[in-house]
Amino acid sequence: GSERTCCPVNWVEHERSCYWFSRSGKAWADADNYCRLEDAHLVVVTSWEEQKFVQHHIGPVNTWMGLHDQNGPWKWVDGTDYETGFKNWRPEQPDDWYGHGLGGGEDCAHFTDDGRWNDDVCQRPYRWVCETELDKASQEPPLL
């Protein structure tokens, strides 16, 4: 594939990555699918600086990120190591709460209104952020 050197239309460049911010909500899996079809992924937060950048753009709105524990341990969608990486959970989170009455626990992470993270039911229709890295090889040509 060709190397991506600038961000797509309607995406925001920051620190050699491109970000796209939704204006409506989808379930985590639909948001994940949307980003992957854009040759991107749900945002992976690797630093306090990136956290503040994303937080500034999303405002005080629940927003999905690319972090989940649907298969057991917490995992970032791009393979970034969770255990050694940046974290910004709210106090007492993640708690895998079962008391919501929707079945199961809470397996998907989102930014809360103050930017800190919470785990929630993956079916909830929250906004989402896609991220793709500049200078990486694009998996697909832009037009077919």
């Epitope: 409506s24 899996a29 639909d30 699918n33 949307y34 079809l37 832009p142 077919l144």
Partner: antibody, heavy 113, light 107 residues
Framework: QVQLVESGGGLVKPGGSLRLSCAAS????????MNWIRQAPGKGLEWVSY????????YYADSVKGRFTISRDNAKNSLYLQMNSLRAEDTAVYYC??????WGQGTLVTVSS | DIQMTQSPSSLSASVGDRVTITCRAS??????LGWYQQKPGKAPKRLIY???SLQSGVPSRFSGSGSGTEFTLTVSSLQPEDFATYFC?????????FGPGTKVDIK
């Protein structure tokens, strides 16, 4: 509530052209990739084309490549399919779909001499 | 292209029956699979997404399972309004492809 309404179908002769439209409402159109999907009479479903939310990434099924053109106008919450060089085998009900979540009721395209 | 096969192609069942429909992908598709219900002259309706997540507003008698290449839709107790055609859709890569459908009618 979410609504997708297709229009523009009808009877056309082989080699002719049609332009299908899909009017979207009840959701944030610019946050959704869109698809055209068709179903020939008595047959299964066939994906036809995809366009991403900003209109810059497009894919087509091999069966329509070079003949059909997908486009969208986010300001008008509308999706289009320009169909040229139509063939009898293009006869089908054409559905628009937002992501793979919401579908319209479809519009019938009949290609016959 | 990823081929989707679906079985059975049709089945006859009674109200209250447990019904299971299977889709198989010719190669791994993660969990990028949806199940849809279609009634004559109507728009398809998504029942299940991401292989096992229930679409909002869909009755809990519908469930999905599977990952990779084999997927199942189960209706735990068939209701009169469930007689319809069901199909799967993979959307992991282009071209998106559908299963040929399963028609569920009254025994």
């Amino acid at each position: 509530q979410v609504q997708l309404v297709e229009s523009g179908g009808g009877l056309v002769k082989p080699g002719g052209s049609l332009r299908l439209s899909c009017a979207a409402s009840g959701f944030t159109f610019s946050d959704y990739y869109m698809n055209w999907i068709r179903q020939a009479p008595g047959k299964g479903l066939e994906w036809v084309s995809y366009i991403n939310s900003n209109g810059f990434t497009i894919y087509y099924a091999d069966s329509v490549k070079g003949r059909f053109t997908i486009s969208r106008d986010n300001a008008k919450n509308s999706l289009y399919l320009q169909m040229n060089s139509l063939r009898a085998e293009d006869t089908a009900v054409y559905y628009c779909a937002a992501d793979t979540i919401y579908w319209g009721q479809g519009t019938l395209v009949t290609v016959s001499s | 292209d990823i081929q989707m096969t679906q079985s059975p192609s049709s089945l006859s069942a009674s109200v209250g029956d447990r019904v299971t429909i299977t889709c198989r992908a010719s190669q791994g598709i993660r969990n990028d699979l949806g199940w849809y219900q279609q009634k004559p002259g109507k728009a398809p309706k998504r029942l299940i997404y991401a292989a096992s997540s229930l679409q909002s507003g869909v009755p809990s008698r519908f469930s999905g399972s599977g990952s990779g290449t084999e997927f199942t839709l189960t209706v735990s107790s068939l209701q009169p309004e469930d007689f319809a055609t069901y199909f799967c859709l993979q959307h992991t890569s282009f071209p998106f492809t559908f299963g040929p459908g399963t028609k569920v009618d009254i025994k």
